[in-house]
């Protein structure tokens, strides 16, 4: 059930998922200078019942300054198949997540974790693709890529979205600009 | 909890003009565009259109084009409808509605959406008549 | 843009019968299909997301099901509560478009 690649990789966009379906896995990695503790679980995992669903274990890094050592800890090799990382991390509001029947949210941040996060993403996934700054997006469907499994082999759907350099004209049929800025948001950023 | 309010029941002339107002509540403003559709007595549902709340860009309906604005207030966390030069077949339900958009950060200007709408306001009887 | 055909337009049947109501794309619109519930003087409740998926809160007698230009909305048991129109929308393409909905009444 798990998927057996990374999802599409499309030039000047992140992808992210807005939560992670049931059998998930997520390794607990931490960053330079520590280490899982001894007794911890290498992954959280995501389960649930027909109610709710959450993060099962809980990660936690200690320092490895006392094996006189900063190396990063290194995944066990089942753990380094199908890494998926997820990229905009920072651009998520935990508490403001759509609570998706059969999804955990987001786990919150753990002490002295990895600034990348691996995940393993299981079939029926969804992620979301996102233009990086500087560009937008040109779209006619949803920038969404979708974990399927066809004929016993698991595939990520093509999303439908080209990233283009900010002075190229991009905009819907039907959308107008915003006539004021009260955000402070840069008016010359036309639209998507 | 999260709800939306919208404003009253209007009764406008041929040619004026009504403003709709959309006040959300219990979430955060920014992390949600909000689409406007409408329904005309004993009628189906139609789509008028699309704001994101950050930078306030919209998508208008084809249909709709020239006559209907779409704005938002952050401070307020209002959003408003107005359409103009209303005519008797503009008679019908107005109803705002959220969905999340993808990406949650403060400068997100694009309109992908995931979901469904999820939560609507109680809709604002207009009614054109002279 | 993207027409969306439901039918019947209107379904009679009996609490505890089994409902299948259609939606047909006039293209594909992937599986980016919602269905709603309507009753007399509310606003539409989401049922279903992405075809398939219910919707949080939503009952397990609801289902969806279909992809590509095809989608069913199926009512295992209809409940008295159940009795309402029923829309089915796209999220495929721009503009978002509603099919022209299906009634379900009691017989």
């Known amino acids: 059930e798990l998927c057996d690649d990374d999802p599409p990789k499309i030039t000047h966009a992140t992808f992210k998922a807005v939560a992670y379906k049931e059998g998930t896995m997520l390794n607990c990695e931490c960053k330079r200078g520590f280490r899982r503790i001894k007794s911890g679980s290498p992954y959280m995992l995501c389960t649930g019942n027909s109610s709710h669903s959450s993060w099962d274990n809980q990660c936690q890094c200690t320092s490895s300054a006392a094996r006189n050592t900063t190396k990063q800890v290194t995944p066990q090799p089942e753990e380094q198949k199908e890494r998926k990382t997820t990229e905009m991390q920072s651009q998520m509001q935990l508490a403001d997540q759509v609570s998706l029947p059969g999804h955990c949210r987001e786990p919150p941040p753990w002490e002295n974790e990895a600034t990348e996060r691996i995940y393993h993403f299981v079939v029926g996934q969804t992620v979301y693709y996102q233009c990086v700054q500087g560009y937008r997006a040109l779209h006619r469907g949803p920038a969404e890529s979708v974990c399927k499994m066809t004929h016993g082999k698991t595939r990520w759907t093509q999303p439908q979205l080209i990233c283009t350099g900010e002075t190229e004209p991009s905009q819907f049929p039907g959308e107008e600009e915003p006539q004021a800025s009260p955000d402070g948001l840069p008016e010359s950023e036309t639209s998507r | 909890q999260v709800q939306l309010v919208q404003s009253g029941a209007e009764v406008k002339k041929p040619g004026a003009s009504v403003k709709v107002s959309c006040k959300a509540s219990g979430y955060t403003f920014n992390s949600y565009y909000i689409h406007w559709v409408r329904q005309a007595p004993g009628q189906g549902l139609e789509w008028l259109g699309i704001i994101n709340p950050t930078g306030g860009r919209t998508i208008y309906a084809q249909k709709f084009q020239g006559r209907v604005t779409m704005t938002r207030d952050t401070s307020t966390t209002t959003v408003d409808m107005e359409l103009s030069s209303l005519r008797s077949e503009d008679t019908a339900v107005y109803y705002c509605?959220?969905?999340?958009?993808?990406?949650?950060?403060?400068?997100?200007?694009?309109?992908?959406?995931?979901?469904?709408?999820?939560?609507w306001g109680q809709g604002s009887t207009v009614t054109v008549s002279s | 843009e993207i027409v969306l055909t439901q039918s019947p337009a209107t379904l009679s049947l009996s609490p505890g019968e089994r409902a299948t109501l259609s939606c047909r794309a006039s293209q594909s619109v992937s599986s980016y299909l919602a269905w709603y519930q309507q009753k007399p003087g509310q606003a539409p409740r989401l049922l279903i997301y992405?075809?398939?998926n219910r919707a949080t809160g939503i009952p397990a007698r609801f289902s969806g099901s279909g992809s590509g230009t095809d989608f069913t909305l199926t009512i295992s048991s209809l409940e008295p509560e159940d009795f309402a129109v029923y829309y089915c929308?796209?999220?495929?393409?721009?503009?978002?478009?509603f099919g022209q909905g299906t009634k379900v009444e009691i017989k």
């Open positions: 509605a959220r969905v999340p958009g993808y990406c949650k950060d403060t400068s997100c200007q694009d309109f992908y959406y995931y979901y469904g709408m999820d939560v």
């Open positions: 929308q796209q999220r495929s393409n721009w503009p978002p478009t």
């Open positions: 992405d075809a398939s």
